[in-house]
Structure formats: structure tokens, C-alpha cells
Amino acid sequence: MAPWPELGDAQPNPDKYLEGAAGQQPTAPDKSKETNKTDNTEAPVTKIELLPSYSTATLIDEPTEVDDPWNLPTLQDSGIKWSERDTKGKILCFFQGIGRLILLLGFLYFFVCSLDILSSAFQLVGGKMAGQFFSNSSIMSNPLLGLVIGVLVTVLVQSSSTSTSIVVSMVSSSLLTVRAAIPIIMGANIGTSITNTIVALMQVGDRSEFRRAFAGATVHDFFNWLSVLVLLPVEVATHYLEIITQLIVESFHFKNGEDAPDLLKVITKPFTKLIVQLDKKVISQIAMNDEKAKNKSLVKIWCKTFTNKTQINVTVPSTANCTSPSLCWTDGIQNWTMKNVTYKENIAKCQHIFVNFHLPDLAVGTILLILSLLVLCGCLIMIVKILGSVLKGQVATVIKKTINTDFPFPFAWLTGYLAILVGAGMTFIVQSSSVFTSALTPLIGIGVITIERAYPLTLGSNIGTTTTAILAALASPGNALRSSLQIALCHFFFNISGILLWYPIPFTRLPIRMAKGLGNISAKYRWFAVFYLIIFFFLIPLTVFGLSLAGWRVLVGVGVPVVFIIILVLCLRLLQSRCPRVLPKKLQNWNFLPLWMRSLKPWDAVVSKFTGCFQMRCCCCCRVCCRACCLLCDCPKCCRCSKCCEDLEEAQEGQDVPVKAPETFDNITISREAQGEVPASDSKTECTAL
């Protein structure tokens, strides 16, 4: 497949000719609620704009210059101005504002809780498998295998801190060297970025929102992948991370500190522990080759236990098997020794839903996975709705200006670094990069934060999660302190190195350009987002894992040609866009390749066939189901609740003809009603001033 889908002719400006990059509609006044009807990602500039079939008049515009789809939408205020309200109206508006704030915080709370439950669900479904990945002996000699294990395990348990703590305990137990642990940590860094990508999928209903949200989420992915692409070979060649961190650990006489403050967990734990509680030690035990752990359930049953250490006499085959010479004797027939036995007495059961069900881990995990995704999606929709209604007019202007404006010259360059610090600080407060980046995703989607600003915030989040790990390491018991601290520092310096590679010079901010490219493609072919997720977080790591198990020869035999082809394509792509004249005429574009290798259109047709049943009748019982429906059928109307795509053919016929931009309507309320957003009466009670 060509590096950029549907590239007939190589152009100097790839952004304008990527799939879905061009042809964006002029920005709607109420962009916070724009629907697919106002967004045709494929239409060329010269196409005539037609009104939808329900319009009574045809208003034709002259072909206009198409707006950059990455420009933030105008969050127009359609409500009555504060000054025009009477006292009753002002009081009502004030309480509406308070109500919205409470609702926003409530949904935000359940959003974070659902992320926690999602992590637990993933651990129940794939935790034991994840533990078994670690018990593979080839990790020690194969850094690439270590990397993909880090990715797979973190994706499976939805928590980089879980996979990192397994690595720490393995290093402390000498089952793993720090050198072998570094690629796993790099992989964990990649794996943790899947969470906000999943969150971005929830915003699939609105193309423009989805474009921004998905790009905003995947900027994290691309940063991590690119950092690994450069830094893993560097680390394998020089071991710079291992050496630097070893010097730091050896030069300081660390005393055990206190645990990292659990700020967000304090609020969310009371709720999440009522849903499910996990015994995370089981995954670590499996990773350490503990056979008994394989039959243990991850679902915690007993929360209060009494542990009593006693010594018991046990028989041994010979005196050589004694625990110590002084504790060895015979009764004249058998040899005996004294063994320390920890006797665990169960006192009180845990108080969570699944405590008495005795369901297998897979069943509990599947139930929680579905429920947490539904809650996550529902909360996200509600957060976006509330933010959409709150962030209008003056409020939006202030927030957007505050977040996205740079410092005055000559200090503009400092803004990004402040954003990195803010990202690190916020992540430190919430104790999870997944939570922070996932909360950021809908804000990018609705246009409050630009991707350019989200990028340093995400980088800061990567740093924040490592500082939490350093604090946690300092609180480790003596035997684990050194190894956990060194691994936490490796994680820290890896992220610092990544930032130095992909942030200081604007030209090197490749993750932004790549994420925007992917956002454009995914906005047009929404199924590609799921495809990307599966390919990058499951298939590629699993393929590398499989090839690594087959041995170095197989891995090199398959890997080298693949890498060679990728490099060749990238070089060709670069030459096509920079100096096409150097190339023979045939190679100046991708037309020499069959269509399926250079465009997603044929693939789209295949996907459409598979999801045909959804396409013909795209009915949804609720907005949550809508999201899944939208992903599958790419239906332009499917996110109008309880509506069906009965006139899908009609919609498909007019696909190349963009809808008239809503600002041509005299009344914005009519425009919004026509778009199926709110009933006509709704605007009268709209209140935005808090």
C-alpha cells in the first residue's frame, strides 16, 4: 500500500491532497454540533454546493476557497444575551450553569471510573495471557521481542503501571536484567497510548469532531512509535539509558520514600471497588513462572485476611534437601526439615458485585468490558454535549485564547514547554497518563484545544507518568528499590529523549503531521480507525512476537525485506513530493500500482459489503449504539437518535455534492434544526453564561 492513500499525483503539499484532507466545508457557525451533512471530505474545490433534499430553496454559491479542516470551529452562542435577561431569567440561567457544571463533573467522574473499570476488564480478559508473555525466555536476548511484549501486555492490561511493576518485580528477582527490561518499558509506553485512541473512537459520529479527536489521540501513538523507532536501535547499540540510569542510581544514596500520592484514586476508588476488585499479584506471579498462579482467579474474593507464619516439619528425600543444616534431622526412617509456612486465614469478603458470582475471569472481564465501554461512550457523549452547550460565545473565546495562544514575541517558543509542564503536572495529579490524555481527547474533538497545543500536553503527560513511577520506586522495599528506580529513570529518560527528538524544532514535529494525516483518512473512511488500532496495537506486535519465537533468522528474513520496502516507499514518496523530475515518468506518481495498493476506495467497498446489513438499515436504540453503527456503516444520518438510513441511496448519490454551508441560512436556529441537532424551541432556553 502506498504511504498516503489515493495519491494519483505527487504534490508538494501533501496536506491538501490526502484522502479527506481537501474539500472541507466552510466552517459552520455552530460547529460544535456539525453533522456529516455539512462535511464532505472528498469534494474538490470546484464542485457545486447543493442544499439537502428537505430544503425548499436552492441556494447556489460561487465556488469558494475551502477552509482548512484543522481550523478550530466557531462555537457560536445561540442563546439570549445575559444583559437582555430579566432577574428570573438570570437566576434560572445561573442555576442552569451550576447544574451543567455538576453534571459535567459527574460525567467526568464516571468517565474516569469507567477507564479504571476498562483497565480491570482488560486485565481479566487478557491479564493471564499478558503474564505468560513475560515468562518467555527469549526476552533476555531479543530487544524487539521485549518491545512487542511491552506493547501487547500493556494493551492487554490497559495499564502501563501494571506492566512496569511486573518488569520491576522480575528485575528485583533477577529473572530479568535492566538491559532486557528497557525495550519492555518502551513497549509499555506505546501500549498505554491505546486508551485515548479508543476514547477517540467514541467521537466517530461527527466527521470533523472525529478528525480532530482521532488525530489528537494518535499524536501520542506516533510520538511513542517514532521515539522507539529511533531510540531502540540507539539503546541496543550504546546502552545509553542503562548507563545513565545506573550512574544516577549508584551516585545517590536513596532512602525509602513515601508512596506517590493517590489523588484521583481517592475519589474514584470508593466507586470502582464496588464494581470489581482485582488481585493484581496473580499477573506478576504468572510472569514469574508460578504454576499455582495460573489457576488463581484475578477477581479478589477476600479483602480481609489474617496471615500467620508458622514452622512445620516436612519430610525430605535426603539431608541435602534441608532448608538449613541446623534444621535437619531423621526419625530413623525419614529425613525431616523445618519449613516456614504462611497460613492465610480468610476473615472478610470483598464488597463488590462479582464477589459471590464465582464466574470465570473471562466472563467477568467480558461483562465489564462491554459495560465500561458503554459507560465510557455515554459519558463522553454527555461531556461533549455539555461542553458544547457551555463553551459558546465569550466563554469559548476566553478558553480557546487562554489554551491556544502563545506567549508574546520573543517568548512564543516557551509556550509549548509550559504546556509540557502543565501536562506533566496534571498527569502527576491524576496519577495516570491514560486518564489525562483521554480527558484531553474530547476537548480536541470539539475544538477547544488545537492539536498543536495537545501535542506538548501529551508529551508532558508522558513525563508526568514517569515522575509518578519514580516516586513509587522510591517507596519500594529495599530489595526492589534499586531496580525499580533504575527502570523508572529509564522510562523518564526515554521520554525526555523522545521529546528532544520530536519537539524542540518545529520541523521535527512529525507526530503532528502523521496524526493529522491519519485523522484525514479516518474522517473519510471511519473503519480505518479501527483497522489502524488493530494493526498497530495487535497485529504488528503479534507478528513480531511470532517471528521472534521462530528465531532470529526468521525475524531477520521477514523483517529486512519489509523494512526495505517501507524505506523504499518513503524515499520514493519524498522524491515525488520534493523533486519529481529526478524520477522516471512512471515513478512520478503511484498510478503504476494497482488501485488497491494506492487507495482505500477498493478496501472501503469490501468493508461496505461486510457491513451491508448495517448499511441498509442503520437503526439505533440509543446514541451509544449509534457510535458502533457509525463505525460500521459510515452512514451520514445514523447519529440522529432512533432514525434509520432509509434514504441511504439518496445520500450516496449526493455524496460528491457538498451540502450548503449553514451560515447561508438567515436564522442560525433554523440551520441547527435542519441539521437535526435541536428542536426549534430549544434555542429560546439556551443558556451559556455561567
Partner: antibody, heavy 119, light 107 residues
Framework: QVQLQQSGAELVRPGASVKMSCKAS????????MHWVKKTPRQGLEWIGA????????SYNQKFKGKATLTVDKSSSTAYMQLSSLTSEDSAVYFC????????????WGQGTSVTVSS | DIVMTQSHKFMSTSVGDRVSITCKAS??????VAWYQQKPGQSPKLLIY???TRHTGVPDRFTGSGSGTDFTLTISNVQSEDLADYFC?????????FGAGTKLELK
Amino acid sequence: QVQLQQSGAELVRPGASVKMSCKASGYTFASYNMHWVKKTPRQGLEWIGAIYPGNGNTSYNQKFKGKATLTVDKSSSTAYMQLSSLTSEDSAVYFCVRGGRGLGTMDYWGQGTSVTVSS
Amino acid sequence: DIVMTQSHKFMSTSVGDRVSITCKASQDVGSSVAWYQQKPGQSPKLLIYWASTRHTGVPDRFTGSGSGTDFTLTISNVQSEDLADYFCQHYRNIPLTFGAGTKLELK
């Protein structure tokens, strides 16, 4: 109370065999090892071997392997030791001793059986 | 085999005195040592096991000590009924072996 009643003194000819008994009472016979100890003025106390009546497992001092055979009859709570190919070296007092539970100690001793090998 | 050596064949004492009988193992036996008392015309009796633990019914004037290779049986305030042969025995491994014995007699 624990009692171990051994059979009476034996006078045997060289090359012959002798089987002595030890009847246990006052405890659960099958739960404790039964040791046999030889006492001579010259060698002092020597451990011959032990048997666990619960399953009939035995253990012998290498020096007495082939010389002594330990058996039990659980129904009568009696332990037996047979000595074969007797020589004057085998003349001694033989004690049956109840072992400590899980220990190689010898809690309760029988009164001893005197064996004299003489032609 | 582990050899248990009781260096004194005889030890003289007076009633009310304190006497220590020693026993040395040819190799480390930990604490797996027992002490026995045999009065003339009687069967031996267990006094001490685990080098220092008194058996039931044994008077507290009998105390055992030591670990590894050197062990001691101490009788404080010797009584006339304590005049007997004393044997040490290890139960570290098979075969169990006894010391040659120490005869305690009146001065």
C-alpha cells in the same frame, strides 16, 4: 502408660537364627517408629534399625543389613526382630524402643532381651 | 557415620554439686542431639532432646546446651538417684549413633 514388653533371654548356637518380640501397649502402635538397639560392654549402644508399623517401612544401619530383619504385627501390636547367622559378636542385650513422633529420639525402652551365642 | 565422643568415661561428684557431661560430634549435627540416663539394672530413659528440651517428667536440674558439634548435659544440685550412665545420641541422619557413655559416681 507406655509399656514395651520384650521376650525372654535366648541362648543360641553359632550360625543359628533368633527371633525376639516386643509387645507394645499404652499408645497407638501404628503411629510411632519402633527402633532396635544393641548394647554390649565393648561397643556400647548401637542402633540396629527402625520400622514404622503404620506402613511397614524400615530403615537399617548399614552394619546390620543382612543380619537383622524387622517386622511388625499390627493386630497384636507386636514388633519382631530376627537375627540370622549368629556369631559370638552378636551376644548382647537387645532393646526395642519407641521413637519420638517425627524425631530420632527414643522415648520409651523395653526391658531388653539378652542373647547369648555359644556352642 | 557421625561419631559421638564422650571424653570422660567416669566423672566423680558429690551430692549437691553441679556437674557437666560433654559430648562432641564428628560433624555438624545442628541441634539434633538427645541425652539418656541408664541406671544399673534398668533400661535407658530419655532426658533431653533437641539438645536442650527436657522430656516429660524430667526434673529441671537437668539442662542441655550446645549446637553444631559441642554439647553439654548439666546436672545442678546432684542427687544420689542421679548416679548412672549418661549417653548422648544424634539424630541428624542415618545411622543414629550414641556416645560411649559417661558414668557418674560419688567421690
